[in-house]
């Protein structure tokens, strides 16, 4: 009559949780039985991120630190079931924690847009294209941002139109701009759950041009033309 190792009730164990669960939340549990009826002690192996703890008696698994989907999902650890007493035989299974993305990163500009300019005076309304991004995982659908002007007072001078889920066009509504810098506030909404909004500023300079670049006194950089 050979002593047998504990047997897990399932091939593997999985649990889906939101990445923003509170520390101390029960995120799953594992169960095993010992063929000889001995008690079982559970432990975890390979918890490299230090996110989890297991109740040695019940097999319940709890979070002990903030979870972050962007670190990679599913998060996989080994669970060990060991006989208490007897030959202390053990078995190994796996617990996979599937982290469901929480929309926790507001949209922002994809790059540095300083240095945008139009040659003054405008001969016709002008436009420029900009790109938004965020740091959430979009599960290969890609972000779907919507764009609007950040304040009502801007609507006399500017309009913003969506090109696709990440790009938009900022256009002047007329040609009567002063020779100075305008800061255009753009509201970007990510349409997530919950929806997050970022208000970004695009500084646009209207300046006298020499050979297609902003003329600046000595010591000032020439600006790149995004016309």
């Amino acid at each position: 009559d050979v002593n047998e190792a504990p047997q897990f009730s399932q091939h593997v164990f999985q649990a889906k949780v939101s990445e923003d669960v509170a520390i101390g939340t029960k995120v799953g549990n594992v169960t095993a039985k010992d063929p000889e009826g001995l008690d079982i002690s559970y432990s975890l192996r390979g918890d490299t991120r230090g996110w989890l703890k297991i109740d040695h008696v019940t097999g319940e698994i709890f979070s002990v630190a903030p979870l972050d989907r962007e670190a990679g999902s599913p998060y996989r650890v080994q669970v060990v079931a060991t006989e208490v007493g007897g030959s202390s035989l053990s078995s190994v299974s796996e617990f996979h924690l599937i982290l469901m993305d929480v929309n926790d990163n507001p949209p922002r500009l994809a790059k540095d847009y300083t240095g945008l300019f139009f040659c003054h005076p405008l001969s016709a309304p002008g436009s420029l294209i900009f790109e938004a991004t965020d740091d959430d995982q979009h599960l290969f659908r890609g972000p779907h941002f919507t764009f609007s002007l950040g304040s009502g007072s801007l609507q006399n001078d500017w309009e913003v139109s969506k090109i696709n889920g990440t790009h938009a066009r900022l256009s002047t509504r007329h040609t009567e701009f002063e020779e100075r810098e305008y800061v255009v506030l753009i509201r970007i909404n990510d349409g997530g759950r919950p929806p997050l909004e970022g208000i970004v500023s695009l500084p646009v300079t209207f300046c006298s041009c020499v050979e297609g670049s902003c003329f600046r006194p000595a010591g000032h950089k020439h600006h790149h033309h995004h016309h």
């Epitope: 009730s9 399932q10 091939h11 593997v12 999985q14 889906k16 390979g46 599913p74 996989r76 078995s91 190994v92 796996e94 996979h96 599937i98």
Partner: antibody, heavy 116, light 107 residues
Framework: QVQLVQSGAEVKKPGASVKVSCKAS????????MHWMRQAPGQGQEWMGY????????EYNQKFKDRVTMTRDTSTSTVYMELSSLRSEDTAVYYC?????????WGQGTLVTVSS | DIQMTQSPSSLSASVGDRVTITCRAS??????LAWYQHKEGKSPKLLLY???VLADGVPSRFSGSGSGTDYTLTISSLQPEDFARYYC?????????FGQGTKLEIK
């Protein structure tokens, strides 16, 4: 990148044995269980069993329990599946696959033909 | 053993169509379910796991739903590269078993 490269096609006579290899690269070999499946002509996928490379623990489908042996060589990151007492109905494409939730990487398959 | 029954066994559709394949387990598998795409002469490709979670690199036109014993794979707008055979598979306990497959053909 993760790759599972299997040995080449085999032709065997009934009653013989075949040993198929699966060499893993691009990840920590000992960290993932390796499963074996097969697909006979015109049939669906059939699970044969798995090996845990870190512990050498194996579990087999009862259907193959007396005829299949899975082993591993950690020095070469290779797992092996040997099937004995071959019969014509063992003619199939044999696949190794890395276990996660489901099988996220598969070998290219090895055709084993059993014919007299 | 847990039996996995897929339907339909074959399906003809056109590019742009919405397609649904169902998979029924002989007992509760608690969303321990994966879906695969298998093209002739190639290895199977994991599409979804845990019934609803897209595997890395899989286009968002693929989605999964279901719980308990009944599960569904949906392709929202068929693309030419989607014509293949599709399998469900449970990984709840051994022996792991697959559905018999659904062959998706171009109409």
């Amino acid at each position: 990148q993760v790759q599972l490269v299997q040995s080449g096609a085999e032709v065997k006579k009934p009653g013989a044995s075949v040993k198929v290899s699966c060499k893993a690269s691009g990840y920590s070999f000992s960290s993932y269980w390796m499963h074996w499946m097969r697909q006979a002509p015109g049939q669906g996928q059939e699970w044969m069993g798995y090996i845990n490379p870190s512990t050498d623990y194996t579990e087999y489908n009862q259907k193959f329990k007396d005829r299949v042996t899975m082993t591993r060589d950690t020095s070469t990151s290779t797992v092996y599946m040997e099937l004995s007492s071959l019969r014509s109905e063992d003619t199939a494409v044999y696949y190794c696959a890395r276990s996660r939730l489901g099988f996220d990487y598969w070998g290219q398959g090895t055709l084993v033909t059993v014919s007299s | 053993d847990i039996q996995m029954t897929q339907s339909p066994s074959s399906l003809s559709a056109s590019v742009g169509d919405r397609v649904t394949i169902t998979c029924r387990a002989s007992e509760n598998i608690d969303s321990y379910l994966a879906w695969y795409q298998h093209k002739e002469g190639k290895s199977p490709k994991l599409l979804l796991y845990a019934a609803t979670v897209l595997a890395d690199g899989v286009p968002s036109r693929f989605s999964g739903s279901g719980s308990g014993t009944d599960y569904t794979l949906t392709i929202s707008s068929l693309q030419p590269e989607d014509f293949a055979r599709y399998y469900c598979q449970h990984y709840y306990r051994t022996p792991l078993t697959f559905g018999q497959g659904t062959k998706l053909e171009i109409k």
